[in-house]
């Protein structure tokens, strides 16, 4: 059974992941540039199911495409450093899902824009945090 300290650590990591994703989404929403239109043309795979920490495998597999899209947004008005940001998220995701479990991600048939993708994973984090609070 999970100890209170491990639950607390999980909650903190989820809160950090949530903040990271919210920061990215806020940056994109604030981005007034033709580049934004181009960013929205990129398609992301969405998980068929995302209710457990093991489903973060689906997020991990989309981090490289996410970094590539964010690289488009580099300007003095977009205050994200994609490599640092994605690296930070990757560390959190690996710790949360556990590196020893092998889970094959199942994706939904429909792809999504970066905004829909981020909102989906933000909702995932919020949902799990709510069960831990």
């Amino acid at each position: 059974a999970p100890t209170s300290s491990s639950t607390k650590k999980t909650q903190l990591q989820l809160e950090h992941l949530l903040l990271d994703l919210q920061m990215i989404l806020n940056g994109i929403n604030n981005y007034k540039n033709p580049k934004l239109t181009r960013m929205l043309t990129f398609k992301f795979y969405m998980p068929k199911k995302a209710t457990e920490l093991k489903h973060l495998q689906c997020l991990e597999e989309e981090l490289k495409p996410l970094e590539e899209v964010l690289n488009l947004a580099q300007s003095k008005n977009f205050h994200l450093r994609p490599r640092d940001l994605i690296s930070n998220i990757n560390v959190i995701v690996l710790e949360l899902k556990g590196s020893e479990t092998t889970f094959m991600c199942e994706y939904a048939d429909e792809t999504a824009t970066i905004v829909e993708f981020l909102n989906r994973w933000i909702t995932f984090c919020q949902s799990i945090i709510s069960t831990l609070t």
């Epitope: 903040l19 920061m23 806020n26 205050h79 994200l80 930070n88 919020q126 709510s130």
Partner: antibody, heavy 113, light 107 residues
């Protein structure tokens, strides 16, 4: 638990910049994402933005984008908030807060010619 | 941006009174709502997080309820040290936004 201590009050001329510091102690600095919130005299609370202290990246409220810069120095466990092109409406108390349960004491910035 | 609307903007009450402050979000924020108390010249103090969870060290006379768009902060029996301004805040999405505040004054 982390404690936050902010720099002292500042008086600035319109058009100038101000840099407010927030020093964290008592816990692992990189575990605490830092928000900045300001409060004009007699007014409510206004979120300015957030910095991830580990990676150093930031996200700002649209109202402040282009005028605000948040940075951190991991060697001194300090985060900074710099606001440029100051105007009288920027006269406010500026707070740093981590996790919303720990706040700095506030820094009064007065913009006056 | 999500707008947070508090009511009333001010109220007068006596020690021992039951006080209720409401907060309405312009869209559903689930339970991603916090309540703060602020006294003049001081930083805000977190009272309630996740709509109904009491922060450590906060007296049990404070309670929060609600989900979705409508939330309530209740002080079951007002004490002299409770006269202050109270703010609600959503952290469901960025930008984080606050209510305009409710000032609780002595009748």
């Amino acid at each position: 638990q982390v404690q936050l201590v902010q720099s002292g009050a500042e008086v600035k001329k319109p058009g100038a910049s101000v840099k407010v510091s927030c020093k964290a102690s008592g816990d692992t600095f990189t575990d605490y994402y830092m928000h900045w919130v300001r409060q004009a005299p007699g007014q409510g609370l206004e979120w300015m933005g957030i910095i991830n202290p580990r990676a150093g990246y930031t996200s700002y409220a649209l109202k402040f984008q282009g005028r605000v810069t948040m940075t951190r120095d991991t060697s001194t466990s300090t985060v900074y908030m710099e606001l440029s092109s100051l105007r009288s409406e920027d006269t406010a108390v500026y707070y740093c807060t981590s996790g919303w349960d720990v706040w700095g004491q506030g820094t009064l910035v007065t913009v006056s010619s | 941006d999500i707008q947070m609307t508090q009511s009333p903007s001010s109220l007068s009450a006596s020690v021992g009174d039951r006080v209720t402050i409401t907060c309405r979000a312009s869209q559903s924020i689930s339970t991603w709502l916090a309540w703060y108390q602020q006294k003049p010249g001081k930083a805000p103090k977190l009272l309630i997080y996740a709509a109904s969870s009491l922060d450590s060290g906060v007296p049990s006379r404070f309670s929060g309820s609600g989900s979705g768009t409508d939330f309530t902060l209740t002080i079951s029996s007002l004490q002299p040290e409770d006269f202050a301004t109270y703010y609600c805040q959503q952290s469901y999405s960025f930008p984080v936004t606050f209510g305009q505040g409710t000032k609780v004054e002595i009748k």
